[in-house]
């Protein structure tokens, strides 16, 4: 044990993908512990990750209660219990996070092409509707359930034998595109929320090509 001063947390950063939301901060604690509190603008502060030596806190359970609310978190620093610090009464040190509105700011996770099916000169490409940790009536909602028509997918597709890409867009999770008969095509999709100003696009999905397992071909 010893005498030491606590230091305030800094670099508070929200890391959020498909509403899985973690607050990270620095520094690694030396002779101190942290407690995180989270609140909406009009709500009460709620303690999470209480008395922890971690430098991250999973706040998903709180933000999924209402993803359209704006949240603020704060990280308190306390001297560890083995620290013989004797100062006068004083509020604990804390640092506020940036405000965070999950609906507007959570990153869109990398989408996955669930399947594609060719019928003649048409191909139907289906994007997996990823489950989120947002609940309604005790069931987890999908990304589409949460975002509705705010979410679109962009399909990039090209002949396996060439590099020229075409694009298609949908506000569902399915594309129906025209292809040349007898040609193999490759596909990649990207999730997009056009109305956003930040974090508008996901990374591209893994590429899937015709003639591989996910596809089906019918005359």
């Amino acid at each position: 044990s010893g005498t030491t001063n606590t230091v305030a947390a800094y670099n508070l950063t929200w890391k959020s993908t498909n509403f899985k939301t973690i607050l990270e901060w620095e520094p690694k604690p030396v002779n101190q512990v942290y407690t995180v509190q989270i609140s909406t603008k009009s709500g009460d502060w709620k303690s999470k990750c209480f008395y922890t030596t971690d430098t991250e806190c999973d706040l998903t359970d709180e933000i999924v209660k209402d993803v359209k609310q704006t949240y603020l978190a704060r990280v308190f620093s306390y001297p560890a219990g083995n620290v013989e610090s004797t100062g006068s009464a004083g509020e604990p040190l804390y640092e506020n996070s940036p405000e965070f509105t999950p609906y507007l700011e959570t990153n869109l996770g990398q989408p996955t092409i669930q399947s594609f099916e060719q019928v003649g000169t048409k191909v139907n490409v289906t994007v997996e509707d990823e489950r989120t940790l947002v609940r309604r009536n005790n069931t987890f909602l999908s990304l589409r359930d949460v975002f509705g028509k705010d979410l679109i997918y962009t399909l990039y597709y090209w002949k396996s034998s060439s590099s020229g890409k075409k694009t298609a867009k949908t506000n569902t999770n399915e594309f129906l595109i025209d292809v040349d008969k007898g040609e193999n095509y490759c596909f990649s999709v990207q999730a997009v929320i056009p109305s956003r100003t930040v974090n508008r696009k996901s990374t591209d999905s893994p590429v899937e090509c015709m003639g591989q397992e996910k596809g089906e071909f019918r005359e």
Partner: nanobody, 114 residues
């Protein structure tokens, strides 16, 4: 300096219960952590339990559901209900409040013996 005054210690038989209380001499903000530590003979002081202003708790592993910490923000008080006491729980129990600094009470002796 925040003064913390404990009460409720004493002699109890193994398997018995005791309730400790601690009151602060001045208003303790709800952002403070309050709790209890103990020092057994020949050992370092160790955390027993702590509680946040909104009632979130953290217990040492050795507590194993035997102790319950609670807090009354209006009374600037923290409590520790100790059940199923064993001789290993014999120690001086210190009230603790942490804000910018740690504050400690003088301690109250708990002796578990038949």
């Amino acid at each position: 300096q925040v003064q913390l005054v404990e009460s409720g210690g004493g002699l109890v038989q193994p398997g018995g219960s005791l309730s400790l209380s601690c009151t602060a001499s001045e208003t303790i903000s709800s952002t403070y952590i309050m709790g209890w530590h103990r020092r057994s003979p020949g050992k370092e002081r160790e955390l027993v339990a702590v509680i946040s202003g909104d009632g979130v708790t953290h217990y040492a592993d050795f507590v194993k559901g035997r102790f319950v910490i609670s807090r009354d923000n209006a009374k600037n008080a923290v409590y520790l209900k100790m059940n199923f006491l064993t001789p290993e729980d014999t120690a001086v129990y210190y009230c603790y409040a942490a804000g910018r600094w740690n504050h400690w009470g003088q301690g109250t002796q708990v002796t578990v013996s038949s």
